[in-house]
Interface confidence: low
Amino acid sequence: TGADTEAVVCVGTACYTAHSGKLSAAEAQNHCNQNGGNLATVKSKEEAQHVQRVLAQLLRREAALTARMSKFWIGLQREKGKCLDPSLPLKGFSWVGGGEDTPYSNWHKELRNSCISKRCVSLLLDLSQPLLPSRLPKWSEGPCGSPGSPGSNIEGFVCKFSFKGMCRPLALGGPGQVTYTTPFQTTSSSLEAVPFASAANVACGEGDKDETQSHYFLCKEKAPDVFDWGSSGPLCVSPKYGCNFNNGGCHQDCFEGGDGSFLCGCRPGFRLLDDLVTCASRNPCSSSPCRGGATCVLGPHGKNYTCRCPQGYQLDSSQLDCVDVDECQDSPCAQECVNTPGGFRCECWVGYEPGGPGEGACQDVDECALGRSPCAQGCTNTDGSFHCSCEEGYVLAGEDGTQCQDVDECVGPGGPLCDSLCFNTQGSFHCGCLPGWVLAPNGVSCTMGPVSLGPPSGPPDEEDKGEKEGSTVPRAATASPTRGPEGTPKATPTTSRPSLSSDAPITSAPLKMLAPSGSPGVWREPSIHHATAASGPQEPAGGDSSVATQNNDGTDGQK
């Protein structure tokens, strides 16, 4: 579907056009581009009101709009692969015509992060609400649409065309019709300001073909920043009406002569311009020579002026425009300084937070503070960082080095630690013996005892648990689970062998095969059933079947 220009508003040095038509953002941008513009920017509250006005004009004529919510594309987009930046007003979006990251924004709701596809912004109009200045259209972001599928509720788009300057509308001193044709191919008979290079066709008369006179004018740059039609005196004047029709086309005063002729004049403090119609203030500030937020300040006796900038800005070389002062040049911050329009802000490096003596100071974040520690066990705060440590019998684990994993002394590298059975426990281990053997006083060796079919020498009670006596581990069959949250037993160990817990008697294996052969320090592994000693079924930390999952608190232990 095509797009119709339904409305136009020209103000300052720009014109905004509103179009109805269900187009994708790319098609809408292409439509604006064909006429020398772009999808509209909304860089300030003032510009938002201009856009609101042109949409109001469009909606006034668009009786067919039945949707309660309507969306109109503007020129704010985020390319595929570019992620959301919540710290910026534009959230990582940028204006299609280029330009800086502007401070004004009016988002409809909090944005969700998605870097996968291109995202485009539309103005969301609630047609059930009056278009009041305090109720500016909200910004809604979403997919950019595609030909034939423009996007949900997309009703149209707004273009912006920028110009060197504007001419005043032509004033008629008698009956007639003015038709303006703009460089962006819009025709209108009523514009508040008419853009440079527009043509004006004036047809004088009251419709009688015989009486109709036509005039053609072009809005030209007469002098730097001075634009006019090159016409002189009111148009379509008629002795029949004199000053009675539209004030004779005069901007301020109209003076009639006795013969039906008349002249335009100006009030005190104003002067008549070369077009003999328009009055301009003798006050040099009235032409708004200052730009970019600069305020015009009259000199003595109102003869000349100077431009003054708001705090955080300074005059540029033209002495007419304000540019941002980069306060960060003076290093006002202890760590990072971010220049912003009209000011700056101090930021702290990762591991520091605002605080301490002086403006913009930063102080170390104590990551180890109570209730804040990212470490599973020991935590040591350092300047701008921290490191984790583990109790004896545990080693640091996890991608971020904040978790502690039990050392399984029964399966580690090195020589045998127990002569026979090895039982791993949380943070420790102990040795055991097969039925018919008993643990020697050294807690490692096994000595022959009375033959029994009872359980092997199982793990002692918690309070009897001995200290670890070394780091070597025998090649005995063991289960070495990782530590679960709070050390609580969970699920079965990850080993594929059947577990032999401390309270389960060995009944499934033939006794002759379990009996030690030769030295009691050697246990020949049975060829059929694999007996495994474990301290109890447990699951890796993190609650799933993977080993030592990373905690998700964003810390990496190393900043």
């Epitope: 009101q49 009786a63 709009l65 009056p130 009041l132 305090s134």
Partner: antibody, heavy 120, light 111 residues
């Protein structure tokens, strides 16, 4: 010249409805919003709602929502305001007034007012 | 709703003297550099008549002895030299937010 002319005075019983008219002349009817404002004896002026004559969009003061209906007849350049479920406190002078389309919607032209009396 | 409070309720001023009426909004009625505050004059048996729009702009045909000032929440209507025909009730109105609301009115009389 620009003029708004309202219908004549009305006397109604509580619970009834009243429909007032406002005929515009001297300007393009569809280029301005039409508002209704009322003034009860000794009370401040109270905005009731507005209509865009070109598209018939209506916006109401929530206080009257459900009781007030504003309509237009473009061909007759006339706006209407109907107020239902009348109560004694609806006794007031009702004015129609026009405003520009966008921005500061001040009321630059007013009708002379219609007196509505609600009494049992 | 934005509540508009006018003071004083009534004012008696000698002919040729200055009359000042105040209007206070419960929240700012400014937007984009403009104040959405208007003043109306109402004479007995007549509809209100627009005097000032956007806080300080004189409606065409209104005598220049009437002037308006203020921004944000505080506004003033001034009659520089009171004339007999200025005896009326004056109302302020905000048009920045729905519902559009009016002040309670200030009655101006001749002393």
């Amino acid at each position: 010249q620009v003029q708004l002319v309202e219908s004549g005075a009305e006397v109604k019983k509580p619970g009834a409805s009243v429909k007032l008219s406002c005929k515009a002349s001297g300007y393009t009817f569809t280029s301005y919003w039409m508002h209704w404002v009322r003034q009860a004896p000794g009370q401040r002026l109270e905005w009731m709602g507005e209509i865009d004559p070109s598209a018939s969009y209506t916006y109401y003061n929530q206080k009257f929502k459900g009781r007030v209906t504003i309509t237009v007849d473009k061909s007759a350049s006339t706006a209407y305001m109907e107020l239902s479920s009348l109560r004694s406190e609806d006794t007031a002078v009702y004015y129609c007034a026009r405003s520009v389309y966008y921005g500061n919607k001040y009321f630059d032209v007013w009708g002379p007012g219609t007196t509505v009396t609600v009494s049992s | 709703d934005i509540v508009m409070t006018q003071s004083p309720d009534s004012l008696a001023v000698s002919l040729g003297e200055r009359a000042t009426i105040n209007c206070k909004a419960s929240q700012s009625v400014d937007y984009a550099g403009d104040s959405y505050l208007n003043w109306y004059q109402q004479k007995p048996g007549q509809p209100p008549k627009l005097l000032i729009y956007a806080a300080s702009n004189l409606e065409s045909g209104v005598p220049d002895r009437f002037s308006g000032s203020g921004s944000g929440t505080d506004f003033t209507l001034t009659i520089s030299s009171l004339q007999a025909e200025d005896v009326a009730v004056y109302y302020c109105q905000q048009t920045n937010e729905d519902p559009r609301t009016f002040g309670g009115g200030t009655k101006v009389e001749i002393k």
